[in-house]
Interface confidence: medium
């Protein structure tokens, strides 16, 4: 058993049929010595008396809010949550496996630049009685500070018969050094509580590996005289790190016909303009990637040829 | 050229060669993103390779103030990686494919380090400890980790030279 926060405790249980469970001793936080009784949740049934209560925690029915009273007055509470371990593996029932970039990916994180700011998100099908708490650091043995906000519900989607809820959190490294080469990964830890079930999820990454620039901005076409060619121009996204002479991007320009089956023409360039042939009903798209480190490409920015 | 006296390197040449190094480092190990840090075993290897740190003066402001600190740091790292790529970790079994970019990568590391410090100029003696003998079963993982670290190192070096070529060239 360990303390998650004040008056909230997590009991770690090996979860199998007829498991013996865990013996827990609760102590009433009071100077009083006699006349103390204990109840669980809203029930008025007295579970025991005395300053301490010893219980055997085996299942969710044994978890919940234990309250000690004296003469109708509440003295203190202890909320017991369960963390299940099945076949030596902690349960992951609350969050959905996003399976990208690999199986058992529950948390996904992205950064728009090298400022030390990043966003993580996760999915669940649970709609109520759900709380999240997020902590992060750079390195684990001698951790350096990363400050995370509160996790918020950022999207709801319908998937077949189910509703899916996306939660996200923004974090910022306290003393970020955008130009340095990271040697210690960022660690992100999410505590998830659904009713009386506790689970924790972790992710470890370098900012450089989760970089995904915003799409190029101000995408414009300029037809070239007496030619089917156009000059496409764009700018670095506002959110990208500066100066651009140091934090450089490379770009992919694509000409795509109306039909998905039509051949795509692609040009790669380090410049912020390119000359391409504009076919009728086609569209021109541009995306960006860090020039020197192959992290994710941005989403496409697009304009129609006409 | 970056020499102890503090003259400038051939920024544009360094830019071109460092960008080539980035391309080679990724073609030598393109699938880097798909391996989980926590599945890689010993973290010591990552700590054993050079890193360009915050105080090394490789940020735009530090380069403007005095690029020598950063260039020396990059030079040290290039020599270090060049030695690693020439060690039995890469030359021993299992053999690399004949067309592996590791050979080109090794030569380019040497080329860029020489551009930074031509013959006859010395920042300091390059000191590198004895490498642990590695076995075939350890080498694949070591190659992966070294190449992945090298990708990060040369990305910073390439940014430095690109910025230098754009803003510090005479």
């Amino acid at each position: 058993i360990w303390e998650l926060k004040k008056d909230v405790y997590v009991v770690e249980l090996d979860w199998y049929p007829d498991a013996p469970g865990e013996m827990v001793v609760l102590t009433c936080d009071t100077p009083e010595e006699d006349g103390i009784t204990w109840t669980l949740d809203q029930s008025s049934e007295v579970l025991g008396s005395g300053k301490t209560l010893t219980i055997q925690v085996k299942e969710f029915g044994d978890a919940g809010q234990y309250t000690c009273h004296k003469g109708g007055e509440v003295l203190s509470h202890s909320l017991l949550l369960l963390h299940k371990k099945e076949d030596g593996i902690w349960s992951t029932d609350i969050l959905k496996d996003q399976k990208e970039p690999k199986n058992k990916t529950f948390l996904r994180c992205e950064a728009k630049n090298y400022s030390g700011r990043f966003t993580c998100w996760w999915l669940t099908t649970i709609s109520t009685d759900l709380t999240f708490s997020v902590k992060s650091s750079r390195g684990s043995s001698d951790p350096q500070g990363v400050t995370c906000g509160a996790a918020t519900l950022s999207a709801e989607r319908v998937r077949g018969d189910n509703k899916e809820y996306e939660y996200s959190v923004e974090c910022q490294e306290d003393s970020a050094c955008p130009a340095a080469e990271e040697s210690l990964p960022i660690e992100v830890m999410v505590d998830a509580v659904h009713k009386l079930k506790y689970e924790n999820y972790t992710s470890s990454f370098f900012i450089r590996d989760i970089i995904k620039p915003d799409p190029p901005k101000n995408l414009q076409l300029k037809p070239l005289k007496n030619s089917r060619q156009v000059e496409v121009s764009w700018e670095y996204p506002d959110t990208w790190s500066t100066p651009h002479s140091y934090f450089s991007l490379t770009f992919c320009v694509q000409v795509q016909g109306k039909s998905k089956r039509e051949k795509k023409d692609r040009v790669f360039t380090d410049k912020t303009s390119a000359t391409v042939i504009c076919r009728k009903n086609a569209s021109i798209s541009v995306r960006a990637q860090d020039r020197y480190y192959s992290s994710s490409w941005s989403e496409w920015a697009s304009v129609p040829c006409s | 050229r970056a020499v102890p006296g503090g003259s400038s390197p051939a920024w544009t040449q360094c830019q071109q060669l460092s960008q080539k190094l980035c391309t080679l480092a990724w073609s030598a190990h393109p699938l880097v993103g798909h391996m989980d840090l926590r599945e890689e075993g010993d973290e010591e290897t990552t700590n054993d390779v050079p890193h360009i740190q915050c105080g090394d003066g490789c940020d735009p402001q530090g380069l403007r103030d005095n690029s020598q600190f950063c260039l020396q740091r990059i030079h040290q790292g290039l020599i270090f990686y060049e030695k690693l790529l020439g060690s039995d970790i890469f030359t021993g079994e299992p053999s690399l494919l004949p067309d592996s970019p590791v050979g080109q990568l090794h030569a380019s590391l040497l080329g860029l380090s020489q551009l930074l410090q031509p013959e006859g100029h010395h920042w300091e003696t390059q000191q590198i400890p004895s490498l642990s003998p590695s076995q075939p079963w350890q080498r694949l993982l070591l190659r992966f980790k070294i190449l992945r670290s090298l990708q990060a190192f040369v990305a910073v070096a390439a940014r430095v030279f690109a910025h230098g070529a754009a803003t510090l060239s005479p």
């Epitope: - | 010591e44 054993d48 890193h51 390059q126 400890p129 004895s130 642990s132 003998p133 590695s134 350890q138």
Partner: antibody
Framework: QVQLQESGPGLVKPSETLSLTCTVS????????VHWIRQPPGKGLEWIGV???????DYNPSLKSRVTISRDTSKNQFSLKLSSVTAADTAVYYC??????????????WGQGTLVTVSS | DIVMTQSPDSLAVSLGERATINCKPS????????????LAWYQQKPGQPPKLLIY???TRQSGVPDRFSGSGSGTDFTLTISSLQAEDVAVYYC?????????FGQGTKLEIK
């Protein structure tokens, strides 16, 4: 928790071969480099040699002609043999491990040591 | 071989006072690439094996009290005990693992004054 324990005869005659065993528990020996170090009574520490994770060895040049270090992975055991001993080889013999890295490490776990006296 | 010279050979310090031991290798132990110094400090009490205190010149081994600290780089290293405790009476050794053969300093005997 990694544990190392040296064992072997406490007395060896001059010109004979000293043989010691180091048994490792609490981890697979394949991920350790195991070193032998000795300490003559009342004196300092001297590195004898190492057997690397892959089974290759390196020895102190001052002892190289007389030392053999080997291992038996099935028994999680390492052995030290020092031939043609003299009274100068009387010492406490330790085995110690370092964790495999790109470069050889420091010794983080040591055995308790075994005293070997060379005397007729 | 790299020769490790420790000073002083013996040292008597009052309880609660600072103790300082030096170690000078005959060549630099600083790896210019990764900026690590391949030097460790050990404490040995009578009848016991050496115990690792500090590695990479300045990193304290887990479980070692924070009164022990290591500093220095290249060819000059120091082990400092900020406030001597009775249980710190021992012989202290430095070790280089930059090149083999690994070599130890000759040891410094620390006693209470």
């Amino acid at each position: 928790q990694v544990q190392l324990q040296e064992s072997g005869p406490g007395l060896v005659k001059p010109s004979e071969t000293l043989s010691l065993t180091c048994t490792v528990s609490g981890g697979s020996i394949i991920s350790y480099n195991v070193h032998w170090i000795r300490q003559p009574p009342g004196k300092g520490l001297e590195w004898i040699g190492v057997i690397w994770t892959g089974g290759s060895t390196d020895y102190n040049p001052s002892l190289k002609s007389r030392v053999t270090i080997s291992r038996d992975t099935s028994k999680n055991q390492f052995s030290l043999k020092l031939s043609s001993v003299t009274a100068a080889d009387t010492a406490v013999y330790y085995c110690a491990r370092d964790k495999y890295g790109l470069f050889p490490g420091y010794f983080d776990y040591w055995g308790q040591g075994t005293l070997v006296t060379v005397s007729s | 071989d790299i020769v490790m010279t420790q000073s002083p050979d013996s040292l008597a310090v009052s309880l609660g006072e600072r103790a300082t031991i030096n170690c000078k290798p005959s060549q630099s132990l600083l790896s210019s690439g990764n900026r690590k110094n391949y030097l460790a400090w050990y404490q040995q009490k009578p009848g016991q094996p050496p115990k690792l205190l500090i590695y990479y010149a300045s990193t304290r081994q887990s479980g070692v009290p924070d009164r022990f600290s290591g500093s220095g780089s290249g060819t000059d290293f120091t082990l400092t005990i900020s406030s001597l405790q009775a249980e710190d009476v021992a012989v202290y050794y430095c070790l280089q693992h930059f090149n083999y053969p690994w070599t130890f300093g000759q040891g410094t005997k620390l006693e209470i004054k």
